[in-house]
Protein backbone atom coordinates (compact mmCIF):
# COMPACT_ATOMS: atom_id res chain seq x y z
CA UNK A 1 0.00 0.00 0.00
CA UNK A 2 2.50 2.58 1.25
CA UNK A 3 4.34 2.25 -2.20
CA UNK A 4 1.43 2.58 -4.18
CA UNK A 5 0.32 5.43 -2.36
CA UNK A 6 3.44 7.18 -2.85
CA UNK A 7 3.19 6.11 -5.89
CA UNK A 8 -0.01 8.53 -6.45
CA UNK A 9 1.20 10.86 -3.97
CA UNK A 10 4.43 12.25 -4.78
CA UNK A 11 3.87 14.56 -1.27
CA UNK A 12 4.14 11.17 0.62
CA UNK A 13 7.67 11.54 0.20
CA UNK A 14 8.24 14.48 1.90
CA UNK A 15 9.93 14.52 5.42
CA UNK A 16 9.06 16.43 8.85
CA UNK A 17 10.17 20.22 8.19
CA UNK A 18 8.99 20.55 4.23
CA UNK A 19 6.07 20.91 2.56
CA UNK A 20 4.78 19.22 -0.60
CA UNK A 21 4.61 22.68 -2.56
CA UNK A 22 1.85 22.88 -5.53
CA UNK A 23 3.90 25.95 -6.73
CA UNK A 24 6.66 23.93 -8.11
CA UNK A 25 5.35 20.91 -9.24
CA UNK A 26 4.69 19.42 -5.96
CA UNK A 27 8.70 19.23 -4.67
CA UNK A 28 9.24 19.12 -1.48
CA UNK A 29 10.37 22.81 -0.42
CA UNK A 30 11.49 23.42 3.41
CA UNK A 31 9.55 25.25 5.72
CA UNK A 32 10.62 28.65 6.11
CA UNK A 33 11.82 29.76 9.21
CA UNK A 34 9.05 30.76 12.12
CA UNK A 35 7.40 27.59 10.81
CA UNK A 36 7.36 24.00 10.94
CA UNK A 37 5.80 20.53 10.28
CA UNK A 38 5.75 17.50 12.50
CA UNK A 39 4.84 14.96 10.08
CA UNK A 40 5.78 13.85 6.47
CA UNK A 41 3.26 14.52 3.66
CA UNK A 42 2.23 17.79 4.55
CA UNK A 43 1.14 20.50 2.08
CA UNK A 44 1.81 23.03 4.19
CA UNK A 45 4.07 24.32 7.23
CA UNK A 46 2.29 25.55 10.41
CA UNK A 47 3.22 28.55 12.02
CA UNK A 48 5.57 28.68 14.95
CA UNK A 49 3.65 29.38 18.27
CA UNK A 50 5.17 32.35 19.93
CA UNK A 51 5.96 32.84 23.69
CA UNK A 52 4.93 36.47 24.34
CA UNK A 53 4.02 38.46 27.14
CA UNK A 54 3.11 36.30 30.35
CA UNK A 55 4.11 33.23 28.81
CA UNK A 56 7.83 32.20 28.35
CA UNK A 57 9.91 29.95 26.26
CA UNK A 58 10.39 26.67 27.04
CA UNK A 59 11.24 24.92 23.90
CA UNK A 60 12.19 26.56 20.61
CA UNK A 61 10.24 26.52 17.52
CA UNK A 62 12.64 24.23 14.59
CA UNK A 63 11.78 23.05 11.37
CA UNK A 64 10.21 19.85 12.92
CA UNK A 65 8.85 20.82 16.21
CA UNK A 66 6.79 24.47 17.62
CA UNK A 67 7.82 26.13 20.40
CA UNK A 68 6.67 25.12 24.01
CA UNK A 69 5.63 28.03 26.11
CA UNK A 70 4.92 28.14 30.35
CA UNK A 71 4.46 30.96 32.27
CA UNK A 72 6.63 33.79 33.60
CA UNK A 73 7.72 33.64 37.72
CA UNK A 74 4.49 34.55 39.23
CA UNK A 75 2.48 32.25 37.43
CA UNK A 76 1.52 28.71 36.18
CA UNK A 77 0.31 27.20 33.27
CA UNK A 78 -3.59 25.83 32.81
CA UNK A 79 -4.82 23.89 29.62
CA UNK A 80 -3.45 21.40 27.63
CA UNK A 81 -0.17 22.72 25.95
CA UNK A 82 0.14 25.91 28.25
CA UNK A 83 -2.64 27.40 26.71
CA UNK A 84 -3.22 29.87 29.67
CA UNK A 85 -1.26 31.42 32.37
CA UNK A 86 -2.83 32.09 36.07
CA UNK A 87 -1.36 33.90 38.76
CA UNK A 88 0.12 32.05 41.81
CA UNK A 89 -1.02 33.07 45.03
CA UNK A 90 0.96 32.41 48.30
CA UNK A 91 0.36 29.07 49.88
CA UNK A 92 -2.89 29.39 52.77
CA UNK A 93 -4.80 32.01 49.85
CA UNK A 94 -6.70 30.86 46.57
CA UNK A 95 -7.44 32.96 43.59
CA UNK A 96 -10.62 34.87 43.30
CA UNK A 97 -11.72 37.05 40.87
CA UNK A 98 -11.21 39.83 43.15
CA UNK A 99 -7.38 38.36 43.05
CA UNK A 100 -5.65 36.05 46.31
CA UNK A 101 -7.65 35.63 49.06
CA UNK A 102 -6.75 33.58 51.96
CA UNK A 103 -8.16 30.55 52.57
CA UNK A 104 -11.83 30.69 55.11
CA UNK A 105 -11.37 28.91 58.67
CA UNK A 106 -11.42 25.62 57.58
CA UNK A 107 -10.01 24.90 55.05
CA UNK A 108 -6.40 25.24 53.27
CA UNK A 109 -4.25 25.37 50.44
CA UNK A 110 -0.71 24.06 50.52
CA UNK A 111 -0.23 25.07 46.74
CA UNK A 112 0.78 28.53 44.81
CA UNK A 113 -2.24 27.45 43.05
CA UNK A 114 -5.74 25.78 43.15
CA UNK A 115 -8.42 26.43 45.62
CA UNK A 116 -8.79 26.21 49.17
CA UNK A 117 -9.72 22.70 50.30
CA UNK A 118 -11.86 21.91 53.72
CA UNK A 119 -9.21 20.10 56.66
CA UNK A 120 -10.15 16.39 56.96
CA UNK A 121 -12.80 15.41 59.25
CA UNK A 122 -10.54 13.31 61.12
CA UNK A 123 -13.74 11.43 63.25
CA UNK A 124 -15.41 10.63 59.87
CA UNK A 125 -12.40 7.37 60.17
CA UNK A 126 -13.43 7.16 63.83
CA UNK A 127 -9.64 9.29 64.90
CA UNK A 128 -8.48 12.81 66.81
CA UNK A 129 -6.73 15.01 65.47
CA UNK A 130 -3.06 15.17 66.21
CA UNK A 131 -2.15 18.39 64.80
CA UNK A 132 -4.13 21.44 64.27
CA UNK A 133 -5.17 22.55 60.53
CA UNK A 134 -3.97 25.93 59.32
CA UNK A 135 -4.37 27.97 56.47
CA UNK A 136 -1.01 26.48 54.64
CA UNK A 137 -1.54 22.70 56.10
CA UNK A 138 -4.37 20.10 56.46
CA UNK A 139 -4.81 18.69 59.84
CA UNK A 140 -2.91 15.27 60.88
CA UNK A 141 -5.13 12.59 62.55
CA UNK A 142 -3.88 10.26 65.37
CA UNK A 143 -5.12 7.79 67.08
CA UNK A 144 -8.76 7.00 67.68
CA UNK A 145 -9.89 8.56 71.24
CA UNK A 146 -10.53 4.66 72.45
CA UNK A 147 -6.94 3.87 71.28
CA UNK A 148 -5.15 6.41 73.76
CA UNK A 149 -7.15 5.35 76.96
CA UNK A 150 -5.33 4.37 80.13
CA UNK A 151 -4.94 0.56 79.92
CA UNK A 152 -5.00 0.13 76.01
CA UNK A 153 -2.30 -1.88 74.79
CA UNK A 154 -0.51 -1.78 71.90
CA UNK A 155 -0.11 -4.17 69.70
CA UNK A 156 3.22 -4.02 66.92
CA UNK A 157 2.69 -6.24 64.18
CA UNK A 158 5.53 -8.29 63.77
CA UNK A 159 7.89 -7.43 61.00
CA UNK A 160 8.03 -8.70 57.66
CA UNK A 161 10.81 -11.36 57.07
CA UNK A 162 13.10 -9.68 55.04
CA UNK A 163 13.67 -11.41 51.52
CA UNK A 164 17.51 -12.83 50.84
CA UNK A 165 18.85 -11.00 48.33
CA UNK A 166 17.45 -7.29 48.67
CA UNK A 167 18.94 -4.49 51.16
CA UNK A 168 16.93 -2.42 53.42
CA UNK A 169 15.68 0.97 51.49
CA UNK B 1 34.72 20.00 13.37
CA UNK B 2 33.87 23.00 10.78
CA UNK B 3 36.97 24.37 8.06
CA UNK B 4 36.75 26.58 4.91
CA UNK B 5 38.65 26.07 1.89
CA UNK B 6 39.04 27.78 -1.63
CA UNK B 7 39.92 31.29 -0.18
CA UNK B 8 42.68 32.56 -2.61
CA UNK B 9 43.69 35.39 -4.63
CA UNK B 10 41.31 36.37 -8.06
CA UNK B 11 40.40 39.28 -10.24
CA UNK B 12 37.47 41.19 -9.97
CA UNK B 13 34.31 39.79 -11.79
CA UNK B 14 35.88 35.81 -11.27
CA UNK B 15 33.36 33.37 -9.62
CA UNK B 16 34.74 31.97 -6.40
CA UNK B 17 33.41 28.87 -4.58
CA UNK B 18 34.24 28.61 -0.86
CA UNK B 19 33.44 25.32 1.14
CA UNK B 20 32.74 24.50 4.32
CA UNK B 21 33.54 20.95 5.56
CA UNK B 22 32.01 19.30 8.27
CA UNK B 23 32.65 16.22 10.38
CA UNK B 24 31.48 14.47 13.82
CA UNK B 25 27.67 15.93 13.04
CA UNK B 26 24.92 16.15 10.68
CA UNK B 27 24.18 18.98 8.46
CA UNK B 28 20.38 17.73 8.42
CA UNK B 29 20.46 18.59 12.70
CA UNK B 30 21.99 21.88 12.23
CA UNK B 31 21.84 25.15 10.80
CA UNK B 32 25.32 26.69 9.13
CA UNK B 33 25.95 30.17 8.94
CA UNK B 34 28.54 32.18 6.45
CA UNK B 35 30.61 35.53 8.16
CA UNK B 36 32.82 37.82 6.80
CA UNK B 37 35.39 39.91 8.38
CA UNK B 38 37.35 42.68 5.89
CA UNK B 39 40.53 43.17 7.33
CA UNK B 40 40.91 45.91 10.23
CA UNK B 41 36.53 45.21 9.97
CA UNK B 42 33.89 43.98 11.79
CA UNK B 43 32.12 40.44 11.86
CA UNK B 44 29.47 40.90 8.40
CA UNK B 45 26.98 38.45 8.40
CA UNK B 46 25.79 36.91 4.95
CA UNK B 47 23.47 33.61 5.12
CA UNK B 48 22.29 30.71 6.54
CA UNK B 49 21.61 27.25 5.89
CA UNK B 50 19.07 25.57 8.35
CA UNK B 51 18.72 22.07 9.01
CA UNK B 52 15.77 21.33 6.77
CA UNK B 53 17.76 23.09 3.52
CA UNK B 54 16.24 26.28 4.13
CA UNK B 55 18.92 29.30 2.71
CA UNK B 56 18.24 32.54 4.03
CA UNK B 57 20.59 35.39 3.01
CA UNK B 58 21.31 38.91 4.42
CA UNK B 59 19.72 41.47 2.83
CA UNK B 60 22.24 43.29 1.63
CA UNK B 61 23.56 40.31 -0.46
CA UNK B 62 21.31 40.71 -3.24
CA UNK B 63 22.46 38.09 -5.57
CA UNK B 64 26.13 38.57 -5.17
CA UNK B 65 26.24 35.52 -3.10
CA UNK B 66 25.09 32.34 -3.28
CA UNK B 67 24.87 29.50 -0.71
CA UNK B 68 24.49 25.82 -1.33
CA UNK B 69 24.55 22.59 1.05
CA UNK B 70 25.29 18.70 0.23
CA UNK B 71 25.27 15.94 3.17
CA UNK B 72 28.65 17.32 4.30
CA UNK B 73 29.46 20.80 2.68
CA UNK B 74 27.91 23.94 2.42
CA UNK B 75 29.13 26.32 -0.38
CA UNK B 76 29.30 30.13 -0.80
CA UNK B 77 29.74 31.23 -4.47
CA UNK B 78 30.36 34.62 -4.73
CA UNK B 79 29.39 35.28 -7.92
CA UNK B 80 30.76 38.26 -9.35
CA UNK B 81 33.84 39.46 -6.90
CA UNK B 82 34.67 43.20 -6.29
CA UNK B 83 37.73 44.58 -3.92
CA UNK B 84 35.50 45.32 -1.49
CA UNK B 85 34.59 41.46 -0.89
CA UNK B 86 38.18 41.21 0.24
CA UNK B 87 37.70 39.40 3.46
CA UNK B 88 38.14 36.43 5.85
CA UNK B 89 35.04 33.86 5.42
CA UNK B 90 34.23 31.74 8.07
CA UNK B 91 32.21 29.07 8.53
CA UNK B 92 30.18 28.26 11.88
CA UNK B 93 27.59 25.66 13.51
CA UNK B 94 24.35 26.53 15.25
CA UNK B 95 23.84 25.17 18.73
CA UNK B 96 20.64 23.30 18.07
CA UNK B 97 18.51 23.13 15.04
CA UNK B 98 15.69 25.81 16.18
CA UNK B 99 15.04 28.96 13.74
CA UNK B 100 16.43 31.49 16.91
CA UNK B 101 19.57 29.83 17.20
CA UNK B 102 23.31 30.57 18.00
CA UNK B 103 26.59 29.72 16.92
CA UNK B 104 29.01 27.63 18.70
CA UNK B 105 31.30 26.18 16.89
CA UNK B 106 33.44 28.16 14.20
CA UNK B 107 36.05 27.51 11.60
CA UNK B 108 39.19 29.24 11.40
CA UNK B 109 38.19 30.89 8.05
CA UNK B 110 39.74 31.40 4.68
CA UNK B 111 40.94 34.44 3.04
CA UNK B 112 39.86 36.11 -0.19
CA UNK B 113 41.70 38.57 -1.88
CA UNK B 114 40.07 40.27 -4.94
CA UNK B 115 42.54 42.45 -6.98
CA UNK B 116 43.44 43.26 -10.67
CA UNK C 1 16.40 45.19 8.46
CA UNK C 2 17.73 44.55 12.47
CA UNK C 3 20.55 46.89 13.13
CA UNK C 4 22.52 46.06 16.38
CA UNK C 5 24.20 48.95 17.30
CA UNK C 6 26.85 48.42 19.88
CA UNK C 7 29.09 50.90 22.04
CA UNK C 8 31.53 52.29 22.83
CA UNK C 9 33.81 51.58 19.56
CA UNK C 10 36.67 51.21 21.99
CA UNK C 11 37.17 51.06 25.68
CA UNK C 12 40.39 51.10 28.02
CA UNK C 13 40.51 49.86 31.84
CA UNK C 14 43.02 48.82 33.91
CA UNK C 15 43.54 44.90 35.55
CA UNK C 16 40.82 44.12 38.07
CA UNK C 17 38.82 46.83 36.68
CA UNK C 18 34.72 46.51 34.79
CA UNK C 19 33.73 46.90 31.64
CA UNK C 20 30.63 47.75 30.24
CA UNK C 21 29.49 46.97 26.74
CA UNK C 22 25.88 47.84 25.53
CA UNK C 23 24.00 46.91 22.31
CA UNK C 24 20.97 48.09 21.29
CA UNK C 25 18.64 46.27 18.75
CA UNK C 26 16.81 48.61 15.86
CA UNK C 27 13.54 46.49 16.84
CA UNK C 28 12.37 44.12 19.85
CA UNK C 29 14.29 40.63 19.62
CA UNK C 30 12.91 39.56 23.01
CA UNK C 31 16.26 37.82 24.41
CA UNK C 32 17.44 36.50 21.44
CA UNK C 33 21.16 38.01 21.77
CA UNK C 34 24.52 36.49 21.84
CA UNK C 35 27.79 38.09 22.93
CA UNK C 36 31.15 36.76 20.87
CA UNK C 37 34.94 37.25 22.22
CA UNK C 38 36.97 37.49 18.89
CA UNK C 39 41.30 38.02 19.12
CA UNK C 40 43.20 38.97 16.29
CA UNK C 41 43.59 35.83 13.98
CA UNK C 42 41.09 33.84 15.82
CA UNK C 43 37.69 33.15 14.73
CA UNK C 44 34.74 34.57 17.28
CA UNK C 45 33.86 32.67 20.62
CA UNK C 46 31.08 31.96 21.86
CA UNK C 47 30.00 34.16 25.25
CA UNK C 48 26.72 34.28 26.32
CA UNK C 49 23.32 33.31 24.60
CA UNK C 50 19.96 33.80 25.48
CA UNK C 51 21.13 37.40 26.57
CA UNK C 52 22.00 36.33 29.67
CA UNK C 53 22.87 32.19 29.53
CA UNK C 54 26.59 31.79 30.00
CA UNK C 55 28.56 29.60 27.62
CA UNK C 56 30.22 26.41 28.29
CA UNK C 57 33.70 27.11 30.04
CA UNK C 58 32.66 30.58 29.92
CA UNK C 59 33.80 32.65 33.22
CA UNK C 60 31.01 34.07 35.84
CA UNK C 61 33.23 37.10 35.51
CA UNK C 62 31.23 37.55 32.12
CA UNK C 63 27.77 38.83 32.87
CA UNK C 64 24.82 39.44 29.95
CA UNK C 65 21.63 41.21 30.80
CA UNK C 66 18.67 43.07 28.99
CA UNK C 67 16.29 42.52 26.76
CA UNK C 68 13.92 43.69 23.77
CA UNK C 69 16.42 46.36 22.66
CA UNK C 70 19.02 46.90 24.85
CA UNK C 71 21.56 44.82 26.17
CA UNK C 72 24.33 44.90 28.34
CA UNK C 73 27.72 43.00 28.42
CA UNK C 74 29.76 43.33 32.01
CA UNK C 75 32.96 42.13 32.20
CA UNK C 76 34.06 42.28 35.66
CA UNK C 77 38.24 41.87 37.20
CA UNK C 78 39.37 42.07 34.49
CA UNK C 79 42.58 40.44 33.01
CA UNK C 80 45.13 41.11 30.76
CA UNK C 81 43.67 37.80 28.36
CA UNK C 82 40.41 39.59 27.94
CA UNK C 83 41.79 41.89 25.46
CA UNK C 84 39.82 41.48 22.82
CA UNK C 85 36.97 42.65 20.36
CA UNK C 86 33.59 41.63 21.27
CA UNK C 87 30.28 41.84 19.33
CA UNK C 88 26.84 41.03 20.29
CA UNK C 89 24.79 39.41 17.48
CA UNK C 90 21.12 38.83 17.09
CA UNK C 91 19.63 35.11 16.72
CA UNK C 92 16.18 36.40 16.35
CA UNK C 93 15.14 34.81 13.12
CA UNK C 94 11.82 35.59 12.49
CA UNK C 95 11.40 39.14 12.02
CA UNK C 96 9.49 40.82 9.76
CA UNK C 97 12.87 41.30 7.33
CA UNK C 98 14.31 38.22 8.16
CA UNK C 99 17.34 39.42 8.64
CA UNK C 100 17.61 37.63 11.91
CA UNK C 101 21.15 37.13 12.79
CA UNK C 102 23.37 40.60 12.29
CA UNK C 103 26.30 41.68 14.26
CA UNK C 104 26.85 44.73 16.25
CA UNK C 105 30.08 46.79 14.75
CA UNK C 106 32.26 45.43 17.47
CA UNK C 107 33.86 47.04 20.78
CA UNK C 108 37.88 46.76 20.91
CA UNK C 109 38.57 46.18 24.77
CA UNK C 110 42.13 47.70 25.68
CA UNK C 111 43.44 46.18 29.01
CA UNK C 112 46.20 48.49 30.79
Known amino acids: FERTRSLQDPCSNCPAGTFCDNNRNQICSPCPPNSFSSAGGQRTCDICRQCKGVFRTRKECSSTSNAECDCTPGFHCLGAGCSMCEQDCKQGQELTKKGCKDCCFGTFNDQKRGICRPWTNCSLDGKSVLVNGTKERDVVCGPSPADLSPGASSVTPPAPAREPGHSPQ | SVEESGGRLVTPGTPLTLTCTVS????????MIWVRQAPGKGLEWIGV?????YISHATWVKGRFTISKTSTTVGLEITSPTTEDTATYFC??????????????WGQGTLVTVSS | DIVMTQTPASVEAAVGGTVTIKCQAS??????LAWYQQKPGQPPKLLIY???TLASGVSSRFKGSGSGTEFTLTISDLESADAATYYC??????????????FGGGTEVVVK
Open chain 2, 92 to 105: ARSADGSWSTYFNL
Open chain 2, 24 to 31: GFSLSTYA
Open chain 2, 49 to 53: VYDNG
Open chain 3, 27 to 32: ESISNY
Open chain 3, 50 to 52: KAS
Open chain 3, 89 to 102: QTNYCCSSSDNGFA
